[in-house]
């Protein structure tokens, strides 16, 4: 592989690494969306909620003079409950219905697939760099692109979950905004998907420049 190509691959891998960090952050944190109730709902405090793939947290926040609920970073009494995805016999203490359990199960499962693709892609990259097997960058690029797509699907499932929670008559939440975990997931999708495609492009052998050349005449790989 030529020096310029190697440089392009390294820059791409750096972008993919940033995507991996963002994806991991999004998956393990629970600030995908912040939900708030009617402002008149409480006199001095309001009960906002923020949630992720694994749990929902409610927080009693002191209301300011502008009668707004938040920001969620303000100190307050916090109550978190994990979605019991994989032990259906047990029920979550709070918000069993209102969290749209089937949506969070789907989003969490797809996010795990995404992490699986990231691990497979990273293994291929490590083997490629360690043993100079450039051809392993091609499956790695595909794994990263698939990981990006899985993150995108998780994002869309969570968007639908938020919409249903806001629309549901069985919740008090009336307003919402997407928070930093959601932003991390969106950025991770862009970096992983585009990074994967770029890596695939840079790891392909040089196409013949002249009609009489064949792929066999291209620069040999290590």
């Amino acid at each position: 592989m030529s020096q310029t190509k190697m440089l392009k691959v390294r820059v791409t891998l750096f972008c993919i690494l940033a995507g991996i960090v963002l994806a991991m952050t999004a998956v393990v944190t629970d600030h995908w969306a912040v939900l708030s109730p009617h402002m008149e709902h409480h006199n001095t405090t309001c009960e906002a909620a923020h949630f992720g793939l694994w749990r929902i947290c409610t927080k009693r926040i002191p209301m300011d003079d502008s009668k707004t609920c938040g920001p969620i970073t303000l100190p307050g009494e916090k109550n978190c409950s994990y979605f019991r995805h994989f032990n259906p016999g047990e029920s979550s203490e709070i918000f069993e219905f209102t969290t749209q359990k089937e949506y969070s199960i789907s989003a969490a499962a797809i996010a795990i697939f995404s992490l699986g693709f990231i691990i497979l892609g990273s293994l291929c990259v490590l083997l490629s760099l360690g043993k100079k097997r450039d051809y392993l960058l091609r499956p790695a690029s595909m794994f990263y692109a698939f990981a990006g797509l899985c993150i995108l699907v998780s994002v869309e499932v969570m968007r639908q979950s938020v919409k249903r929670m806001i629309d549901s008559e069985d919740t008090v939440w009336i307003e919402y905004y997407y928070s930093w975990s959601f932003a991390c997931a969106c950025a991770a999708f862009i970096l992983l998907f585009l990074g994967g495609l770029a890596l695939l492009l840079f790891s392909l052998p040089r196409m013949p420049r002249n009609p009489w050349e064949s792929c066999m005449d291209a620069e040999p790989e290590h």
């Epitope: 109730p37 008149e40 219905f97 549901s168 919740t171 009336i174």
Partner: antibody, heavy 116, light 108 residues
Framework: QVQLQESGPGLVKPSETLSLTCTVS????????WTWLRQPPGKGLEWIGY???????NYNPSLKSRVTISVDTSKNQFSLKLNSVTAADTAVYYC??????????WGQGTLVTVSS | EIVLTQSPGTLSLSPGERATLSCRAS???????LAWYQQRPGQAPRLLIY???NRATAIPDRFSGSGSGTDFTLTISRLEPEDFEVYSC?????????FGGGTKVEIK
């Protein structure tokens, strides 16, 4: 399918306390919000207030000083108490599932007349 | 509190005709959080529309909702005999929740 049924006296004397109970069947009272509404004869509906199964409640400011909503999870029931009633409190009282949005599941309603 | 005014008070139409019911709010309703109900005498209200335009489960597609801000409309495209009832609007954009006085749709 969740079903709600209101019960209580149909006649209450002025200045006394109106007490109604809503029994929920077909679903657990847990994890949901439960609301009381009323409709005076020939008039529109009025939201009274709601309670969460944990016991936290919120009321219409116009009735807040007179109203108490409580919940009994063991009996799958929630109740309404309205103090110092007058003829203006004569209405069909409904219980419903939900809190501060729209209401899909309603009881059949019970007419309460305030008269001496 | 938000006051909802429904017009007309009574609407006289024939089966098969189109009914247009209006609900006007005294101030803007946040996020178009408005619901429509149908109420038969001696029965509890039945949810038709929520979020100004979303049809509730099992509601026929002849019922549709539209509008935003302060002006909202419930349209029944072709009136069926069972549609001649009272219709109420309800806002849930701010507390306290409030309801309109209702529009009675009667057979001409």
């Amino acid at each position: 399918q969740v079903q709600l049924q209101e019960s209580g006296p149909g006649l209450v004397k002025p200045s006394e306390t109106l007490s109604l109970t809503c029994t929920v069947s077909g679903d657990s009272i847990n994890n949901y919000y439960w609301t009381w509404l009323r409709q005076p004869p020939g008039k529109g509906l009025e939201w009274i207030g709601y309670i969460y199964y944990s016991g936290s409640a919120n009321y219409n400011p116009s009735l807040k000083s007179r109203v108490t909503i409580s919940v009994d999870t063991s009996k799958n029931q929630f109740s309404l108490k309205l103090n110092s009633v007058t003829a203006a409190d004569t209405a069909v009282y409904y219980c419903a599932r939900g809190a501060v949005k729209y209401f899909r599941h309603w009881g059949q309603g019970t007419l309460v007349t305030v008269s001496s | 509190e938000i006051v909802l005014t429904q017009s007309p008070g009574t609407l006289s139409l024939s089966p098969g005709e189109r009914a247009t019911l209006s609900c006007r709010a005294s101030q803007t309703i946040n996020h178009n959080n408005l619901a429509w109900y149908q109420q038969r005498p001696g029965q509890a209200p039945r949810l038709l529309i929520y979020g100004a335009s979303n049809r509730a489960t099992a509601i026929p597609d002849r019922f549709s909702g539209s509008g935003s801000g302060t002006d909202f409309t419930l349209t029944i495209s072709r009136l069926e005999p069972e549609d001649f009832e009272v219709y109420s609007c309800q806002q849930y954009g701010s507390l306290p929740l409030t309801f309109g006085g209702g529009t009675k749709v009667e057979i001409k």
